[in-house]
């Protein structure tokens, strides 16, 4: 490329006419602040090409940057586009006009920047200085660009002097923005509503002051665009916040919503998700099995839990046999519901030191407008077992009968046993089990009844023995499910002048013994 | 000198128009947002109307929506603010005034204060 | 619209004193938020922007913090001069706001 006359730097008179010519191997066009200008283009046979700009009625506005550049420049060297800077000296024009994209310089490092205050003359002084300020600072001055250095966060303005009269150019607001990583979280007001409630989504990004946020969601794929709203978040500057909000929701918004933030300065990007769900209307539904007989220990606390998933939220209602239950003032009930997440519950009852009573059918039902659900039990109440009579007779028959009697919830079995050697049993000899096959001959009579006012059953068995020919320790144990007791009698032969008898807890006995129970031998009776 | 000259306080009747002037110098006009902004006898300042450098935004406050519009030209280095159907409340002394916002840096502005004001115009509603 | 309240509406000082100037924003502003000093019959002029940068030609003695929904404007060693109604303002989404004001007087 060839420009006449070649420059760099012009310096023309103010309304004068003036030529410039480019010449080049291909088409070639003149260029200022990126457009192109009226010029006359022309093809010579030596297949050079040249390029005519008349400039005419020159003002000092007219001072700049001029390009000469192939036409289609893209992917081009550098030195294959010729710069030439005219200066038109015009004592009308002061400072040139800049827009607002030159008077507001924002940085987001420390660096050179060049504040672009720029006049018609290259022979005037031209001075910086802060808005408002008079000393000028010692800053080096181009008079093709403007004073370049590092700056301060300040609003900075240029003077000079045009013949008697001093000039001020606008004022340059230096900024030092914060930008870092990004890093984004989207929440949703509701990721589960209703056909015809709003949708809400929000968009954080920390610590940048210059992010662009890019909504994607199933509305904008079907054309239909909703404008986001930026604004502030919290007690500090820099959480920027973009708000989505959809008002009267459809079933065709159920599905991704991303926002997107992007950090133009170095390029930052990062993305989130959440997916929402509306509904045709709201729903209750059970999580889980809860069985059908559930269970609870006497005098222990016990609680009963229900999970459930439901939108909106619903009410919760505990009932007792068909009654409404309540936090009790004497604290032997309570009722908790809890939202675990957005739209799953768990609903608590707890029955503090239970009692008999509490025994019964309970039903829990979870309800709203659109829908309910009822989920039913059967609680029982299990009391331990307890042996409440061990005693022994002498029929005139000639045997001898053990009977024993107890109380428990379930239904608790009965296990008999024996053992001939007083001073080395239990510890060192294990008990032999009576009422089956035993070498004693003994038989086994148990009648089981149910006490309704109680809640629980009541265990009577006895056991005949034919020949007790030495002193014999009996043991009657009762077990259930949660729990066992048992006390021993010593049986003596009907020969000996004196019976002794006592009576064994099962703390004395210092050991457990793995009994089986003669089961098919129980005869139940119920009341 | 950077300054604001303002013209075209009266008194005007209720249900009466007004348009107010604002000529700019010794800066860029065309570069800067400019406000309006008024202050009711004894009261505090009132944010009325504001407009970007090219019209493309405008923006008003509540009480005046659909009554007032704001317009420059920037060839003439002036602001206007038409009033149009007004009311006794509307009586206050108008300042235009330079709104330093700078362009969009992401999706929102910074902001700078108002720096530059013109000496006020009173404006007043009544029968 | 977001409210901005000053407090407090008037305070009394003398020459030499330090005084503190509150506004509050009824929602977060992140800090753009300018005080301007108004005397009788004249404009306003700018003092702080962005909630604690002094305005060019500003007396170093007036200095503004804060950020959110609090902000305060500090002068401290009060001049002759400084007695004016002082106003801080917001900017959100395109609009602003006032604060009502807060009249400094000598005491």
């Known amino acids: 490329l060839v420009i006449t006359p070649p420059g760099p730097e012009l310096i023309l008179n103010v309304s004068s006419t003036f030529v410039l010519t480019c010449s080049g191997s291909a088409p070639v066009v003149w260029e200022r602040m990126s457009q192109e200008l009226p010029q006359e283009m022309a093809k010579a046979q030596d297949n050079t090409f040249s390029s005519v700009l008349t400039l005419t009625n020159l003002t000092g506005l007219d001072t700049g940057e001029y390009f000469c550049t192939y036409n289609d420049s893209r992917g081009l060297e550098p030195d294959e586009r010729k710069r030439l800077y005219i200066f038109v000296p015009d004592p009308t024009v002061g400072f040139l006009p800049n827009d607002a994209e030159e008077l507001f310089i924002f940085l987001t490092e420390i660096t050179e920047i060049t504040i672009p205050c720029r006049v018609t003359d290259p022979q005037l002084v031209v001075t910086l200085h802060e808005k408002k300020g008079d000393i000028a600072l010692p800053v080096p001055y181009d008079h093709q660009r403007g004073f370049s250095g590092i700056f301060e966060d300040r609003s900075y303005i240029c003077k000079t002097t045009i013949g008697d009269r001093e000039v001020d150019s606008d004022a340059y607001y230096v900024y030092r923005l914060q930008v870092s990583s990004i890093n984004v979280s989207v929440n949703a007001v509701q990721t589960v509503v209703r056909q015809g409630e709003n949708i809400t989504l929000m968009c954080i990004v920390i610590g940048n002051e210059v992010v662009n946020f890019e909504w994607m969601y199933p509305r904008k794929e079907s054309g239909r665009l909703v404008e986001p709203v930026t604004d502030f978040l919290l007690d500090m500057p820099y959480h920027i916040r973009s708000i989505l909000h959809i008002p009267s929701a459809e079933l065709e918004d159920s599905g991704t919503y991303t926002c997107n933030v992007t950090e133009s300065v170095n390029d930052h990007q990062d993305e989130k998700a959440i997916n929402i769900t509306v509904v045709e209307s709201g729903y209750v539904r059970l999580l889980g099995e809860v069985g059908a007989l559930q269970f609870a220990e006497l005098h222990r606390s016990r609680t009963l839990q229900v999970v459930f998933e439901a939108y909106p939220p619903p009410t919760v209602l505990w009932f007792k046999d068909n009654r409404t239950l309540g936090d009790s003032s004497a604290g032997e009930i309570a009722l908790s519901t809890r939202n675990v997440s957005e739209t799953r519950y768990v609903s608590e009852l707890t029955l503090v030191r239970v009692k008999v009573a509490e025994a019964g059918h309970y039903t829990m039902r979870a309800f709203h407008e659109d829908a309910e659900v009822q989920l039913s039990f059967q609680l029982q109440i299990n009391v331990p077992v307890r042996v409440l009579e061990l005693s022994e007779s002498h029929p005139d028959s000639g045997e001898q009968t053990v009977r024993c009697r107890g109380r428990g919830m379930p239904q608790p079995n009965i296990i008999w046993s024996a053992c001939r050697d007083l001073k080395r049993c239990p510890r060192e000899l294990p008990p032999m089990l009576l009422g089956n096959s035993s070498e004693e001959e003994s038989q086994l009579e148990t009648n089981v009844t149910y006490w309704e006012e109680e809640q629980e059953f009541e265990v009577v068995s006895t056991l005949r023995l034919q020949h007790v020919d030495r002193p014999l320790s009996v043991r009657c144990t009762l077990r259930n499910a949660v729990g066992q007791d048992m006390q021993e009698v010593i049986v003596v032969p009907h020969s000996l002048p004196f019976k002794e008898q006592k009576l064994i807890s099962e703390e004395d006995l210092g050991g457990e013994q793995k009994l089986i129970s003669e089961e098919d031998l129980h005869h139940h009776h119920h009341h | 000198e950077v300054q604001l000259v303002q013209s075209g306080g009266s008194l005007v009747q209720p249900g009466g128009s007004l348009r107010l002037s604002c000529t700019a110098s010794g800066f860029t006009f065309s570069s800067y947002w400019m406000s309006w902004v008024r202050q009711a006898p004894g009261k505090g300042l009132e944010w009325v109307a504001n407009i970007q450098q090219d019209e493309s935004e405008k923006y008003y406050v509540d009480s005046v929506k659909g009554r007032f519009s704001i317009s420059r030209d920037n060839a003439k280095k002036s602001l206007y603010l038409q009033m149009n159907s007004l009311r006794a409340e509307d009586t206050a002394v108008y300042f235009c005034a330079r709104d330093l916002v700078p362009p969009r840096q992401g999706d929102y502005y910074h902001y700078f204060g108002m720096d530059v004001w013109g000496q006020g115009t009173l404006v007043t509603v009544s029968s | 619209a977001i409210r901005m309240t000053q407090s407090p509406s008037t305070l009394s000082a003398s020459v030499g004193d330090r005084v503190t100037i509150t506004c509050r924003a009824s929602?977060?502003?992140?800090?753009?938020l300018a005080w301007y000093q108004q005397k009788p019959g004249k404009a306003p002029n700018l003092l702080i922007y962005?909630?604690?940068s002094l305005e060019s030609g500003v007396p170093s003695r007036f200095s503004g913090s804060g950020s959110g929904t609090e902000f305060t404007l500090t002068i401290s060693g009060l001049q002759p001069d400084d007695f004016a109604t002082y106003y801080c303002q917001q900017y959100n989404s395109y609009s602003r706001t006032f604060g009502q004001g807060t009249k400094l007087e000598i005491k």
């Open positions: 929602q977060s502003i992140s800090d753009w």
């Open positions: 962005k909630a604690s």
